[in-house]
């Protein structure tokens, strides 16, 4: 699996999950999130050669097409597969509230 | 929606579905598919600016991060959203068989 366990331990050029720390205020301009100050959102990147963690029959077909037609611009792309939520603290006026934001942290990638 | 109805009618630079005809023999080397000879598989391409058909909160966050940090390599990617099957005819020896291959035709795209 192209997950954090594998990708963070290996120097993998092809599609894999990469570490990315985002500071809510500095990187997004989000002043409304009080805690945490930032988090590891991570991201997916790297080429998708034929059969590498293909998501659908279409991505398999497209990967093969791209291999046999390397000049073609059509190729699968490395995108998130498994995502996890992030719990944040925010305020309504002076009242603290806790919310779980879904699909905030990339744990693994796929070729789609 | 970034679907064939919209994308095939507009000169859209950003993420959209693009027409792509694949000939099974010539483009894939698949001699085993007897009918059809080829089909419109289509593919997704184009930049994913902030909020363009964002798939998850993570892709929204990543799009905003990329807007405010344009030198960063992390950005959402344009990938298939809705896919349709394709019915094919193949042979087992001299016995014709019909099979529906799932997720073969891209009908719309998203930024993931």
């Amino acid at each position: 699996a192209l997950d954090t366990n594998y990708c963070f331990r290996n120097l993998e050029e092809n599609c894999c999950v990469r570490p990315l720390y985002i500071d809510f205020r500095q990187d997004l301009g989000w002043k409304w999130v009080h805690e945490p100050k930032g988090y590891y959102a991570n991201f997916c990147s790297g080429p998708c050669p034929y059969l590498r963690s293909a998501d659908t029959t279409h991505s398999t077909v497209l990967g093969l097409y791209n291999t046999l037609n390397p000049e073609a611009s059509a190729s699968p792309c490395c995108v998130p597969q498994d995502l996890e939520p992030l719990t944040i603290l925010y305020y309504v006026g002076r009242t603290p509230k806790v919310e779980q934001l879904s699909n905030m942290v990339v744990k693994s990638c796929k070729c789609s | 929606a970034l679907d064939t109805n919209y994308c095939f009618r507009n000169l859209e630079e950003n993420c959209c579905v693009r027409p792509l005809y694949i000939d099974f023999r010539q483009d894939l080397g698949w001699k085993w598919v007897h009918e059809p000879k080829g089909y419109y598989a289509n593919f997704c391409s184009g930049p994913c600016p902030y909020l363009r058909s964002a798939d998850t909160t993570h892709s929204t966050v990543l799009g905003l991060y990329n807007t405010l940090n344009p030198e960063a390599s992390a950005s959402p990617c344009c990938v298939p959203q809705d896919l349709e099957p394709l019915t094919i005819l193949y042979y087992v020896g001299r016995t014709p068989k019909v099979e529906q291959l799932s997720n073969m035709v891209v009908k719309s795209c998203k930024c993931s």
Epitope: L28, G29, W30, K31, W32, I88, Y90, Y91, V92, G93, R94, K97, E99, L101 | L51
Partner: nanobody, 126 residues
């Protein structure tokens, strides 16, 4: 482009009512925080209350609690400040402010808002 335009100010007698409107444009659908502030002559800008456009969560300052109510109409992209039982000390210029980035919540602090309306004058006198 983000814009906030207030209206509804005017002159009213003590005990009277006014409803201020803040028309919001350039925000992502149903998202963002709107705060109401007022500035009396020679005083600092004071936070009166705020609302989260997504879920309608509101907060009101103690000085106006029970008299002022904030509501929103996401179809009309408008946030309202209903002011009842007005007092002479409620006079000043009233501003709405916006933070389009807020997925949840809203702030009582003016420094948290990037966008401001032009203000509308409220006078309370007999």
């Amino acid at each position: 482009e983000v814009q906030l335009v207030e209206s509804g100010g005017g002159e009213v007698r003590p005990g009277g009512s006014l409803r201020l409107s803040c028309v919001v444009s350039g925000f992502t659908k149903d998202y963002g925080a709107i705060g109401w502030f007022r500035q009396a002559p020679g005083q600092e800008r004071e936070g009166l209350g705020c609302i989260a456009r997504k879920d309608g969560d509101t907060w009101s300052a103690d000085s106006v609690k029970g008299r002022f109510t904030i509501s929103r109409d996401n179809v009309r992209n408008t946030v309202y400040l209903q002011m009842n039982a007005l007092k002479p000390e409620d006079r000043g210029v009233y501003y709405c402010a916006g933070d389009p980035s807020a997925l949840y919540g809203c702030s009582d602090r003016s420094s948290e808002y990037q966008y401001w309306g032009q203000g509308t004058q409220v006078t309370v006198s007999s």
